[in-house]
């Protein structure tokens, strides 16, 4: 179902001050400039729809150019509580507090928000990424240390008149960026409180948010170049499917990954790629300007629609799932990494997917919208697409019901 109804108050179609407010690149994340404290301290913050804590570097670290200095803020309040966030690889820990926060290229408001001041971390900050913290935009259920810690976006909506919705346009460059180019480049837009019609073409199609923790959705069918993978649709969502701007790749459950790679290999068999390419280990290169995009298939994910028995599909190109990589040793060529990888925690629709689309996180109506991004990389023959409706039966059966345990949900 497309969103052709009149827009709600506050959802005007142009948010000029927020357009182009993101920088970065898919491999190291997209970040927005934020200010924290009084007087304001400016930091670059990773936009992450796969977590729910607002956490910033608050101590010197070799990979940080700057960090939040709580002692310099007259509005900082200590919550006298620690927070520890382990991942499968790495972790961060810190101290909880609140302070005044604003987004210079966002809504003209200041909110008091919870902040995790990161004092120690391992494998969290990325050398050269140019961000100093993370803005977790998902729901309270996965906030650390527990769901009583109100996430930033909840605080923003509660304390202001900003509508309960944000949208993301992540723009992959289509070519590798060196450090100075990243600093100067446009990475996309985070529109807080609305939808900017200049950022997409065609119609927005919405899929329900299955459960408000991660931004969980249901995939009902997968096609490679129009060929159905023909798997039980539960496999596509085992153990969940989420939309996560903080992940680089399209990550697929083991069985689905193996089937998808087999199908992509078959479709692109005119060239023989090393096994290491499909593993994400080896790059493949072509002479500059000669990348044979046409030999690689398009990938379509069918998502549950808003109407019973109705779905729609989003289709990405190899320009999205082959990630350009700069390597000095092969700098005369165009080199790429395969940006689809295996997951043990379900499907993750990361930057590889999001760079093809304008994605609307309509929290107010518990749905996520997709439209073709005005900045997606394509060629003269094919373009990313959002199309529907399609008739799909028994879509509810595609969702996997995770057995309830006390285990961490963030161990990804």
């Amino acid at each position: 179902e497309t969103d052709e109804e009149p827009e709600e108050p506050g959802r005007r179609g142009s948010f000029v001050e927020m357009v182009d407010n993101l920088r970065g690149k898919s491999g190291q994340g997209y970040y927005v400039e934020m200010t924290v404290g009084s007087p304001p301290q400016t930091l670059n913050i990773l936009v992450d729809t796969g977590s729910s804590n607002f956490a910033v570097g608050a101590a010197p670290h070799p990979f940080l150019h700057r960090y939040y200095q709580r002692q310099l803020s007259s509005t900082y309040r200590d919550l006298r509580k620690g927070v520890y966030v382990p991942y499968t690889q790495g972790k961060w820990e810190g101290e909880l507090g609140t302070d005044l926060v604003s987004i210079p290229h966002g809504p003209n408001v200041t909110v008091r928000a919870n902040i995790a001041a990161i004092t120690e971390s391992d494998k969290f900050f990325i050398n050269g990424s140019n961000w100093e913290g993370i803005l977790g935009l998902a729901y309270a259920e996965i906030a650390r240390p527990d769901d009583s810690l109100e996430p930033f976006f909840d605080s923003l909506v509660k304390q202001t008149h900003v509508p309960n919705l944000f949208s993301l346009q992540l723009c992959g460059a289509g070519f590798p960026l060196n450090q100075s180019e990243v600093l100067a480049s446009v990475g996309g837009s985070m529109i807080i409180g609305g939808i900017d019609h200049s950022l997409y073409t065609g119609s927005l199609w919405y899929t329900p948010i299955r459960r408000e923790w991660y931004y969980e959705v249901i995939i009902v069918r997968v096609e490679i170049n129009g060929q159905d993978l023909k798997m039980d649709c539960k496999e596509y969502n085992y153990d969940k499917s989420i939309v996560d701007s903080g992940t680089t790749n399209l990550r697929l459950p083991k069985k689905v990954f193996e089937a998808a790679v087999k199908s992509i290999k078959a479709a692109s068999s005119t060239e023989k790629f090393p096994d290491g390419f499909w593993l994400g280990e080896q790059l493949v290169c072509w002479q500059a300007g000669t990348t044979p995009w046409n030999i690689f298939p398009v990938i379509s994910l069918y998502l549950m629609g808003e109407v019973t028995n109705q779905s729609f599909r989003i289709t990405i190109l190899p320009q999205q799932y082959l990630r350009p990589v700069e390597d000095v040793a092969t700098s005369q060529d165009d080199c790429y990494k395969f940006a689809i990888s295996q997951s043990s925690t379900g499907t993750v629709m990361g930057a590889v997917i999001m760079e093809g689309f304008y994605v609307v996180f309509d929290r107010a109506r518990k749905r996520i919208g997709f439209a073709v991004s005005a900045c997606h990389v394509h060629d003269e023959f094919r373009t990313a697409a959002v199309e529907g409706p399609f008739v799909t039966l028994d879509m509810e059966d595609c969702g996997y019901n995770i057995p309830q345990t006390d285990e961490s949900t963030l161990m990804t």
Epitope: P274, E281, Q282, T330, C335
Partner: antibody
């Protein structure tokens, strides 16, 4: 400039173990896999295995899976190879190398001598 | 495992000559072959990837060719600094394997 700095030569006793290091610089460490290669005089080059610094995923040559263990410390951009139960067969020069297309960058070599 | 065979262990040439070093794979590896140069006491240096592409900074007198199972590294206008051992490598499938090496001697 991409550089792989390996630890110094090791003289070790049979039956013991040794841990070699390879410190990377000049690129985003977590973006490329690190490989280890063994070279014995007159026996050419043998691929031992590799590790993905972004998530510590490893893949080994079956021949070395009980001999070598690869680990990584991203905070120092360093990869390690632990060699266990050393015998004279493990006396060799060891290299770390970085992925790209094949192995465009190599460390400067670590000589391991196993001797009683 | 894929066996990479360099049948010539030694090759002798003169400065200014053209020399071809061959490598044979035991099964089809496409063009997923690299060539390395190793001088005495040094680490291998990458010369060629994808069978025929030169790495940045490699002199254009080094040329790679071949696909499938048969590969050749050609050095035209051999220089004295080319005295080294040359190895081929397949990176088509795991485990990655290397040829036994060909030592180039300058007359």
């Amino acid at each position: 400039e991409v550089q792989l700095q390996q630890s110094g030569a090791e003289l070790v006793r049979p039956g013991t173990s040794v841990k070699l290091s390879c410190k990377a610089s000049g690129y985003t460490f977590t973006s490329y896999w690190i490989h280890w290669v063994k070279q014995r005089p007159g026996q050419g080059l043998e691929w031992i295995g590799m590790i993905d610094p972004s998530d510590s995923y490893t893949k080994y040559n079956q021949k070395f899976k009980d001999k070598a263990t690869l680990t990584v410390d991203t905070s120092s951009s360093t990869t390690y190879m632990h060699l266990s139960s050393l015998t004279s067969e493990d006396s060799a020069v060891y290299y770390c190398a970085r992925s790209g297309v094949a192995f465009p960058y190599w460390g400067q070599r670590t000589l391991v001598t196993v001797s009683a | 495992d894929i066996v990479m065979t360099q049948s010539q262990k030694f090759m002798s040439t003169s400065v200014g000559d053209r020399v071809s070093i061959t490598c044979k794979a035991s099964q089809n590896v496409g063009t997923n072959v690299a060539w390395y140069q190793q001088k005495p006491g040094q680490s291998p240096k990458a010369l060629i990837y994808s069978a025929s592409y030169r790495y940045s900074g490699v002199p254009d007198r080094f040329t790679g060719s071949g696909s499938g199972t048969d590969f050749t590294l050609t050095i035209s206008n051999v220089q004295s600094e080319d005295l080294a051992e040359y190895f081929c490598q397949q990176y088509n499938s795991y485990p990655y394997t290397f040829g036994g090496g060909t030592k180039l001697e300058i007359k």
